[in-house]
Interface confidence: low
Amino acid sequence: WELTILHTNDVHSRLEQTSEDSSKCVNASRCMGGVARLFTKVQQIRRAEPNVLLLDAGDQYQGTIWFTVYKGAEVAHFMNALRYDAMALGNHEFDNGVEGLIEPLLKEAKFPILSANIKAKGPLASQISGLYLPYKVLPVGDEVVGIVGYTSKETPFLSNPGTNLVFEDEITALQPEVDKLKTLNVNKIIALGHSGFEMDKLIAQKVRGVDVVVGGHSNTFLYTGNPPSKEVPAGKYPFIVTSDDGRKVPVVQAYAFGKYLGYLKIEFDERGNVISSHGNPILLNSSIPEDPSIKADINKWRIKLDNYSTQELGKTIVYLDGSSQSCRFRECNMGNLICDAMINNNLRHTDEMFWNHVSMCILNGGGIRSPIDERNNGTITWENLAAVLPFGGTFDLVQLKGSTLKKAFEHSVHRYGQSTGEFLQVGGIHVVYDLSRKPGDRVVKLDVLCTKCRVPSYDPLKMDEVYKVILPNFLANGGDGFQMIKDELLRHDSGDQDINVVSTYISKMKVIYPAVEGRIKFS
């Protein structure tokens, strides 16, 4: 018996087609992805093949103005239109709190939404009961397939699930649910979830009875043969893991942003064992036409977005200096504003001993592309912020050793004075440079804001300490020459859309007046 699994993950609000780098589509003839194009391909496969499942491994929420405005209603609407068979909850599904998941998505989705390792407690338990499930048994042709879901247990540090959801260890939570499916005579079981490729492989290895793992969170691109675009494969598709009980378990993921549709064909024997598996992600490029009815629906929903982008978010009573002559040479107040917003967006008081789990931000000055003049009645709009942060990136959470941070700050000024983009703006950090010293030895003081303290204060950076830092995904990926960050980071979790972070902060503060206050000094 043959099953075709179509899968997406980490779509992050890319409902419309995008450029090849998943930013805003500029030249339509070269654009990719989007739900209208995805629907064309899915329908084509559904017509050609008998047993097809369309699955999503989480993080539909967060990433473009679509989510900012529609807050998840767009996800339910278009996933329903594409007739998804199941979805796993990702960490970003909790970005607007549990209510922001329940109302727009859980109550509106016409497909099961899954996670076996999230347990509700207190008053939430009855409120959310039945709205998401640990597993679902789906009829496919003449057979049944069990889908069991999982979500990153780091979600409380990455999003806003509140205090009434407990995120358990994935493997511990999955095993009893898979065992339950086995007792129900379900012998073909897919683990669908959002914990990253390393955990996906561990689930394949450790959870007895899981036949296939469909993952997300780490934006992993797997491919067999010559890859069709810019993404470099992390391994073959499917990636085969040998389980502890000797089975070959295919593990798949389909990069991110709806650029590819994962396509995996599995052949099962009559006892539900995987005999063979093969496939590849399908690049959703312009050779695949956009479905006209879905496209018309997208255009209808778009109208509200255009109106939103010119509405006032808040006011500034000071000039927001985002000029390159400031932000690439010294502390600039636009950099301070953005870093303050980045920290504010990551406030998670999960432990009495810590005022917050993260206190530090770094931001490449070259990523700040425009100032905002306060003389326009102080008005700040989404459109203004899109000029400051035009690249459609995310502000991510990483863990780095102090020694890596020190290298990053040395890199920040290694060729100081040439208006290059690597000069770092900061939050929760006081740095002093001595530019008279040779490159690589210019940081004379680097103090960081404590987290394990009731009154935050600045302490010297410890080389062997591990620190959490918020930074642009561009830096996490080694951009602007920050190779040491990419090479030495201990953990990397994708965060929220950059403009959304700053716009939310401005809306919350209502009136802003960021200063230059001695975060960056030269001795």
């Epitope: 987290t451 080389m463 062997d464 591990v466 953990r491």
Partner: nanobody, 113 residues
């Protein structure tokens, strides 16, 4: 004076388990990242795992999913639970706060096939 005392080593069969302990004194334990290292005969000392003051952990690839580092700040002790042991895990295991500080005596772990 930083003092580190490792214990819990021994000889086990492949697939067996051990729990190592390291009692620390002379450091502000609760605000210190703690590390487990190991040194096989004729090789350099290598990092195995670390745990930050916040409880965040890091493991080298070769032990991921098999070893678990934990800490008890009230006892100034860090632990290393080692499951599914393999012959290549045979080494002297050391704990440390900041690499480069004085090392303890270590505890010998021998895994036989």
């Amino acid at each position: 004076q930083v003092k580190l005392q490792e214990s819990g080593g021994g000889r086990v069969q492949t697939g067996g388990s051990l729990r190592l302990s390291c009692a620390a004194s002379g450091i502000s334990f609760s605000i210190t990242t703690m590390y487990w290292y190991r040194q096989a005969p004729g090789e350099q000392r290598q990092l195995v795992a670390l745990i930050t003051d916040r409880g965040n952990t890091y493991y080298v690839d070769s032990v991921k999913g098999r070893f678990t580092i934990s800490r008890d700040d009230s006892k100034n002790t860090v632990y290393l639970q080692m499951n599914d042991l393999k012959p290549e895990d045979t080494a002297v295991y050391f704990c440390n706060s900041i690499p480069g500080n004085d090392w303890g005596q270590g505890t010998q772990v021998t895994v036989s096939s």
